[in-house]
């Protein structure tokens, strides 16, 4: 006959931090040395035995005299209420045929965590609980005095809960957020009427969720140490030492070795010299609440990240070539390195790849003379490319070479009694053609009428012009640029004995914001090209002199430069260059890139004032030095008369007042007789020039009173 195997000696212990009940019991009457499969049903009640809050089954194999263990976690802090536990059992083993029946319940075991025995009248639980963001948390208060009104607040906002008994109220906080690393504050205040009986707060420590490490990778630079790195993600450390930053551990499964890492995002692993080639690493991130891990499997020889090359040098450097040498840190015998060279200079970048064993060498060719280059090199394992090393670099400068192009030369010839004054100009050679620092220019002047006669003028750089006084002969002038290595090709220009073509008429042109568009008639006969030169009309020609070379088949060009300023007049001359390099003036043009209104008004004199007329004149007014072509003048006249004088028409001034206006369309007409006036009458006048852009500045009117008919002026 079967004995009911009732659970006995039930003991319940608690873990307040984990909010767990731990049950221990034994089963009496179990046959000696026999194992039975059994099911235990456990009941848990809260506050009173009739209030069952949890029922569950626990299946296990039971041995004779065995102490059984089972734990249960409460969502409610154990300090909030008394709990009761009982247990019954059922044999569920094939060795015993049906029917199986449940044993009697054990007696109720009462569990009370007395943390509210102090002098306070209000307690809040749990104290200093650590949870993960997104967790559901239950808190409670225990009030000694049921007459007290208790209000609770989460981060200053009142919360409402469920009363478990007259002394206890519980609050369910769903999916708690991370607010700050020193915790979330919750407090309750007990009061009677308007009198505070006490306040009690707790800190709920909410941790951010531990992330899986990202970008986990290991590599070696010397086959002695593996350097592993990862992105740790969010730091889950909390204040008050409640939870330190997460820890990181490396575990290698083939060797079974483990290492606690001391840095949050990297760890070094010593490679043992036992020829282990394959590594299987697990990186474990861990905090008080959870573990996260990530795995990598790799062959050591496929993860070589070399130290950067060293001893970068340049040998046999000349104007156009150099040999670049470098060394690499030798890490294994018969190791082949792939190296990449980058050459930066003159705004360009070239890239070359080379395979080496120990020392690197590369022949750099087609370099520019007198140029600073930056060359750098990086290397990698040629057999199993993993990643490039860091760059190692050095600057070097190629040697100078003789200038490769003749200077661009032009001239201004001015005729003076008995001679020519030739002002010679040249443009500095570009860096590309100078091939070094230009030290001086040689100007060789050869009299073509007396071939044996020549002069050499040496002009130190950076001068870009010189003045030559020559007699009325024909001259060939050569200009040569020199640096420390040698001389450039010569630039040749011929000055004719004949005077320049003075019959050329000057033509007015209008510029645009883009500059000046010029065209000309082709020069009769053979030409090797055209030259357009220009300068500021009002300035000394040497100050702002420019020129442009144009090909022989071109009869138009656009001169565009940022130097053109609004309101400035520029004079252009177009020359044809004959095969003998003699310049012939073809056309002259003048104009403004943008005309402006006149900057000043003429100084007007009043002449021959009579009782019926007066004469206005402004003979001294210069039309040349104006910010636009003066097209004429506006004469404004005010009088008491309602009607305007003949030739004058009504006009409204900018201030809204009315007057009479007369327009003079000839800029050289600088006088006007105003007649048909009344004696002893008061008149006012004002004269302003105008360009295509408008009138001159507004100014005050000048007052004139005609005398009586008997007066003589």
């Amino acid at each position: 006959e079967r004995l009911p195997l009732t659970p006995v000696s039930l003991k319940v212990s608690t873990n307040s931090t984990r909010q767990s009940l731990h049950l221990q019991w034994t089963v009496h009457n179990l046959p000696y040395h026999q194992e039975l499969k059994m099911v235990f049903q456990i009941q848990i009640s809260r506050i009173e035995t009739s209030n069952v809050i949890w029922v569950g089954n626990y299946s296990t194999t039971v041995k004779w005299n065995q102490v059984l263990h089972w734990s249960w976690e409460s969502e409610l802090p154990l300090e909030c209420a008394t709990h009761f536990v009982r247990i019954k059992s059922l044999v569920d083993d094939a060795k015993f045929p049906e029917p199986n029946f449940w044993s009697n319940w054990s007696s109720w075991e009462e569990v009370s965590v007395q943390d509210s025995t102090g002098q306070d009248i209000l307690f809040v639980f749990p104290k200093d609980k650590l949870v993960e963001e997104g967790t559901n948390v239950t808190i409670c208060y225990v009030s000694r005095n049921i007459q007290n009104n208790v209000s609770c607040y989460l981060e200053g906002k009142q919360i409402h809960g469920e009363q478990l008994d007259p002394h206890v109220t519980a609050f369910n906080l769903n999916s708690v957020p991370f607010i700050r690393n020193k915790g979330t504050n919750i407090y309750c205040e007990a009061s009677q009427g308007n009198v505070s009986e006490g306040m009690k707060g707790i800190v709920l420590f909410v941790s951010k969720v531990l992330e899986e490490p990202k970008d986990f990778s290991c590599e070696t630079e010397d086959f002695k140490t593996l350097h592993c790195t990862w992105d740790p993600g969010t730091d889950t450390a909390l204040g008050w030492s409640k939870q330190p930053s997460q820890s990181y551990t490396l575990f290698e499964s083939f060797s079974g070795e483990k290492k606690l890492c001391t840095h949050k995002n990297w760890c070094n692993w010593q490679i043992t010299q036992d020829s282990q080639e394959t590594y299987n690493f697990t990186l474990i991130a861990e905090n008080y609440l959870r573990k996260r891990s990530v795995n990598i499997l790799f062959n050591l020889t496929h993860r070589v990240y070399l130290m950067n090359p060293f001893s970068v040098n340049f040998e046999n450097v000349n104007a156009t070539n150099a040999i670049m040498t470098w060394k690499v840190h030798s890490i294994r015998n018969n190791f082949t390195y792939l190296c990449q060279i980058e050459l930066h200079g003159e705004g360009k970048m070239m890239q070359y790849n080379v395979s080496i064993k120990v020392n690197g060498e590369y022949f750099l060719s087609e370099l520019e003379p007198a140029t600073e280059y930056m060359a750098r090199v990086r290397c990698a394992d040629a057999s199993h490319f993993w990643k490039w090393s860091e760059w190692s670099g050095q600057n070097f400068t190629t040697l100078e070479a003789a200038p490769s192009e003749a200077p661009d030369v032009w001239r201004i010839v001015s005729l003076e009694p008995g001679n020519h004054t030739v002002t010679l100009f040249w443009k500095p050679l570009s860096k590309l053609h100078a091939n070094g620092k230009i030290l001086f220019y040689n100007v060789v002047v050869e009299n073509l009428d007396k071939p044996s006669s020549s002069e050499l003028h040496s002009i130190p750089a950076p001068a870009n012009s010189t003045k030559l006084i020559l007699d009325r002969c024909s001259y060939q002038i050569c200009v040569i640029a020199n640096n420390s290595v040698g001389a450039s090709p010569a630039s040749v220009i011929v000055i004719s004995a004949d005077p320049e073509n003075k019959e050329v008429e000057e033509e007015r042109i209008a510029g645009t914001e883009g500059g000046f568009s010029l065209s000309w008639k082709p020069q009769p006969g053979d030409v090797i090209g055209y030259v357009v030169d220009w300068c500021d009309h009002t300035q000394d020609v040497l100050g702002d002199f420019q020129w442009k070379n144009v090909g022989p088949n071109t009869t138009s060009t656009v001169i565009s430069t940022d130097a053109f300023r609004p309101g400035v007049r520029y004079d252009f001359r177009i020359y044809g260059l004959s095969t003998k390099r003699i310049a012939c003036l073809l056309e002259k043009k003048t104009g403004y890139s943008q005309e402006l209104a006149p900057s000043d008004n003429p100084h007007v004199l009043v002449d021959t004032l009579t009782s019926h007329s007066f004469t206005l004149s402004w003979k001294d007014y210069s039309t040349e030095s104006q910010p636009g072509f003066i097209q004429g003048y506006h004469v404004y006249l005010k009088s008491k008369a309602r009607q305007c004088h003949p030739r004058f028409e009504k006009a409204v001034l900018s201030d809204g007042s009315e007057c009479c206006k007369y327009k003079i369309d000839n800029p050289e007409e600088k006088a006007l007789i105003v007649d048909n006036l009344k004696p002893e009458s008061f008149y006012e006048f004002f004269i302003t020039p105008f360009t295509s852009a408008g009138e001159g500045p507004s100014a005050t009117f000048t007052k004139v009173t005609t005398p009586d008919e008997h007066s003589s002026m």
């Epitope: 102090g118 002098q119 307690f123 915790g183 504050n185 407090y187 009690k200």
Partner: antibody
Amino acid sequence: QVQLVESGGGLVQPGRSLRLSCAASGFTFDDYAMHWVRQAPGKGLEWVSGISWNSGSIGYADSVKGRFTISRDNAKNSLYLQMNSLRAEDTALYYCAKDITSSGWYWFDYWGQGTLVTVSS
Amino acid sequence: QPVLTQPPSASGTPGQRVTISCSGSNSNIGSNAVNWYQQLPGTAPKLLIHSHNQRPSGVPERFSGSKSGTSASLAISGLQSEDEADYYCAAWDDSLNGPVFGGGTKLTVL
């Protein structure tokens, strides 16, 4: 009835030491963080140090770090402040204050009457 | 030098409304609760307002607190002669890892 009574103040020479005590009653002492706050004559309040219910977390103002040590004895319901290398600027009325929470970063709902520390040669 | 800034003095006549300001930074008032303490002449400080605007039981409704950004203020309406005292604002400071106080405002009832 919550009571906090400070003692141990007095006149002391610069560079010397002093130990303040605070006897607590009327509440469950080991359930709360405790603090020391001082007030120089005619001046405002300055937090000096704080300690959590189980001494697991301790904090100090920069002005006293390395010189002052806070401690508690929950069995004796007492809070202490060991003050070493005292300076003239430490002269103040030292208050013992009770936090409303165990971890100690809320506010002080009860204060003692203070004990005067005078540092002078 | 106090971390939180208060006006040194304020005054009002009985029945009037008086406001005391307290300005700080992101690391204190900007991210933490503000508390106010009242210190009557010759006595220890007493908690007046906590969590920006919460009055402990027993503190008259005439006292109210508010916070905006990195500033807080204490308002006293219907001023009474017994309100003459020093008022201190306080908040936890995340940078200094401790509570910080204002320099205090002496309120005079005229």
